[in-house]
Amino acid sequence: LEVQVPEDPVVALVGTDATLCCSFSPEPGFSLAQLNLIWQLTDTKQLVHSFAEGQDQGSAYANRTALFPDLLAQGNASLRLQRVRVADEGSFTCFVSIRDFGSAAVSLQVAAPYSKPSMTLEPNKDLRPGDTVTITCSSYRGYPEAEVFWQDGQGVPLTGNVTTSQMANEQGLFDVHSVLRVVLGANGTYSCLVRNPVLQQDAHGSVTITGQPMTFP
């Protein structure tokens, strides 16, 4: 029995609903009484949802899953996962049994966009050319871990003296803090780009240090 699922991972935003597609080809004369359908976590085989004996057996996964009962008879065994969480990320197996059996696994990739970065400067006054300053770029509640890039006003990447830390909160979402240490010129713009690698979403923040009555020694 051929069971079909999408090759590419299903990407779902945290808090939204996701559909894990799964289909099979019912033979003529097929009835739902003949169908056994199991959705389970691929790695642990933990039961997620099942259909047996002509009836939806319900969710075994935090009551956040549902089948599409009106479509089952046409071979649509897809699973709806509601209010997606970071912890849902992984592989789900769709196991179909009639007079033969087949299974296939579909991957769920969870994502959350990062907030617009906030920029802080330390120290933030009485700055003179040649001073070393610390610029911190902070972006919150994203998933998965971000890629962080720094550049100057001319678009030149700044890779030295950058320290980036990412901490997951209780929901599994990441707060990213990236620190750039630079020696000031007469004036300058420093930009931070926080990229979500799954959503291909870039969040930008920048700070411009100008107008100081600075004299070079």
């Epitope: 029995l1 009484a33 003949q34 056994n36 047996a52 004996e53 009639i98 033969d100 087949g102």
Partner: antibody, heavy 118, light 110 residues
Framework: EVQLLESGGGLVEPGGSLRLSCAAS????????MHWVRQAPGKGLDWVAV????????YYADSVKGRFTISRDNSKSTLYLQMNSLRAEDTAVYYC???????????WGQGTTVTVSS | QSVLTQPPSASGTPGQRVTISCSGS????????VNWYQQLPGTAPKLLIY???QRPSGVPDRFSGSKSGTSASLAISGLQSEDEADYYC???????????FGGGTKLTVL
């Protein structure tokens, strides 16, 4: 009439190998999953392995995993069980059975006896 | 040790009604169907009940099956001497992706 006929059983020493066959007739063989089930002397039924119709999906009991291989040749309507590293506890009558709705096994062969002894 | 639990023996007199129980768990009987097999002495097993309560053609309506939660039962009414056999319940275990049998119940007709 739907029929399953096992063969290939016999006496083998511990550590040896044996290949069982099951010839099917009377139904569209490639459309159905097939099982092997065994029964040790005086004991109950013990599921061994299953294979789906096209031969792409298999599952095994933990007790035989890595030692037994289930396969099929749909052009010959034949099911196989390759048994390696045989142990005394593998001694049993081995039945091939046809997959049916709701995980049932609706047709059984007459069985073939495997004895593992030195 | 079997995953599904059956009483090792049961008995009854001709004409009586006998019930054989089968106890499982949420991941086998609680999730899927229960099937029952009859094995007459010296013969291969035969499917008696599938989908917890359905009889294949040729099985007398004296045999009936039921399921509730994680348990199932096989009832034989109007017991006959030819019903003397071993009876096995079976299911699919979704937590292991394996088929599981009960240990079998030997039915004696007194």
């Amino acid at each position: 009439e739907v029929q399953l006929l096992e063969s290939g059983g016999g006496l083998v020493e511990p550590g040896g190998s044996l290949r069982l066959s099951c010839a099917a007739s009377g139904f569209s063989f490639s459309s159905y999953g097939m099982h092997w089930v065994r029964q040790a002397p005086g004991k109950g039924l013990d599921w061994v392995a299953v294979i789906n119709g096209e031969g792409s999906g298999t599952y095994y009991a933990d007790s035989v995993k890595g030692r037994f291989t289930i396969s099929r040749d749909n052009s010959k309507s034949t099911l196989y069980l390759q048994m390696n590293s045989l142990r005394a506890e593998d001694t049993a009558v081995y039945y091939c059975t046809k997959y049916y709705y709701n995980y049932a096994m609706d047709v059984w062969g007459q069985g073939t006896t495997v004895t593992v002894s030195s | 040790q079997s995953v599904l639990t059956q009483p090792p023996s049961a008995s009854g007199t001709p004409g009586q009604r006998v019930t054989i129980s089968c106890s499982g768990s949420r991941t086998d009987i609680g999730t899927t169907s229960v099937n029952w097999y009859q094995q007459l002495p010296g013969t291969a097993p035969k499917l008696l009940i599938y989908q917890s309560h359905q009889r294949p053609s040729g099985v007398p309506d004296r045999f009936s099956g039921s399921k509730s939660g994680t348990s199932a039962s096989l009832a034989i009414s109007g017991l006959q001497s030819e019903d003397e056999a071993d009876y096995y319940c079976a299911s699919w275990d979704a937590s292991q992706n394996t088929w599981v049998f009960g240990g079998g119940t030997k039915l004696t007709v007194l």
